[in-house]
């Protein structure tokens, strides 16, 4: 019989580079089966993860997994770093792997860089 | 019947580059959920993941080991290829390839059936 | 990085006896992504569970797994002597993918 455990799945790609002053969703995929559980998201900061209380959120359901998601409106130079989604559910707390977001300020790129130039020049991610 | 097959050199020198090929059959590197994946062991310890290769030729690599690896893959010809440059001693190891699949949804991993058949593996030295 | 510990690092039983095999999680996992492999000397690993709990093809039913979140266990209700080999608990992630406990001689008492 399938598991009603909540699950907190991974996406494959786990790292995004995105441009500041664009909005961006970042997805927490989770799986569950009658009661919706407590999700909420941190940013890491160094070994602990704080959490993002005043930040736009938002629920979208799909036929096999639901979506969590933290809202960009829009990307700042200083969501650069690494997300992490939790769950809590019957007393239980669930972790899902870290994503981490690359952020290009638009003040030092004058245009966009293709996704080639930010893997052949990775101080773009940081500049 | 799924198989696979490791092949390359047994003995390498310090500071070479290692070049190992994985030959398989019973299935497709085209195919959506498939993968291939590189694992060693030296001798008398534990599994060691190196790098994986996805059917959509998606990369990923083991963090502490990133910048000597290069996977890639033939899929006319069956053949994942995986390079390790500066091989060194401690590389002393037998190389396993095996293959992986898994359910993706929107990107989302949701079943992973984990590495379910593997090569013979191929014992690589490495020493002056 | 997700570090799977496993416990005992070796265990001594007899045939016919239940053996238990702990993988411990520094962070929780889903278990949808943890299996279990099996290694006997001179071979490749073999796979036995994944997703926790669903046996691989080929598998006889005396193997079985069970955990979430941080702590998964691989049962062998009764050993055969071809059970006596290496355990090893892995789990599939996002970065780094894959990571592989240290893992669990089991060897004949």
């Known amino acids: 019989k399938e598991s009603c455990d909540v699950q907190l799945y991974i996406k494959r790609q786990s790292e995004h580079s995105i441009l500041a002053g664009d909005p961006f969703e970042l997805e927490c995929p989770v799986k569950y089966c009658a009661n919706r559980p407590h999700v909420t998201w941190c940013k890491l900061n160094g070994t602990t993860c704080v959490k993002l209380e005043d930040r736009q959120t938002s629920w979208k359901e799909e036929k096999n997994i639901s979506f969590f998601i933290l809202h960009f409106e829009p990307v700042l130079p200083n969501d650069n770093g690494s997300y992490r989604c939790s769950a809590n559910f019957q007393s239980n707390l669930i972790e899902s792997h870290s994503t981490t977001l690359y952020v290009t300020d638009v003040k030092s790129a004058s245009e966009r860089p293709s996704k080639d130039e930010m893997a052949s020049r990775p101080w773009l991610l940081y500049s | 019947q799924i198989t696979l097959k490791e092949s390359g050199p047994t003995l390498v020198k310090p500071t070479q580059t290692l070049t190992l090929t994985c030959t398989f059959s019973?299935?497709?590197?085209?195919?959506?959920?498939?993968?291939v994946g590189w694992i060693r062991q030296p001798p008398g310890k534990a599994l060691e993941w190196l790098a994986l290769?996805?059917?959509?030729?998606?990369?990923r690599y083991s963090p502490s080991l990133k910048s000597r690896l290069t996977i890639t893959k033939d899929t006319s010809k069956n053949q994942v290829v995986l390079t390790m440059a500066n091989m060194d001693p401690v590389d002393t190891a037998t190389y396993y390839c095996?293959?992986?699949?898994?359910?993706?949804?929107?990107?989302?991993?949701?079943?992973?059936?984990?590495?379910?058949?593997w090569g013979q593996g191929t014992t690589v030295t490495v020493s002056s | 990085e997700i570090v799977l510990t496993q416990s005992p690092g070796t265990l001594s039983l007899s045939p016919g006896e239940r053996a238990t095999l702990s993988c411990r999680a520094s962070?929780?996992?889903?278990?949808?992504?943890l299996a279990w492999y099996q290694q006997k000397p001179g071979q490749a690993p073999r796979l036995l569970i994944y997703?926790?709990?669903s046996r691989a093809t080929g598998i006889p039913d005396r193997f079985s797994g069970s955990g979430s979140g941080t702590d998964f266990t691989l049962t062998i209700s009764r050993l055969e002597p071809e059970d006596f080999a290496v355990y090893y608990c892995?789990?599939?992630?996002?970065?780094?993918?894959?990571?592989f406990g240290q893992g669990t001689r089991l060897e004949i008492k």
């Open positions: 997703g926790a709990s």
């Open positions: 962070q929780s996992v889903s278990s949808t992504y």
């Open positions: 095996a293959h992986i699949r898994i359910t993706e949804v929107r990107g989302v991993i949701i079943s992973y059936y984990g590495m379910d058949v």
């Open positions: 019973g299935f497709s590197l085209s195919t959506s959920g498939v993968g």
């Open positions: 892995q789990q599939y992630g996002s970065s780094p993918p894959i990571t």
């Open positions: 290769i996805y059917w959509d030729d998606d990369k």
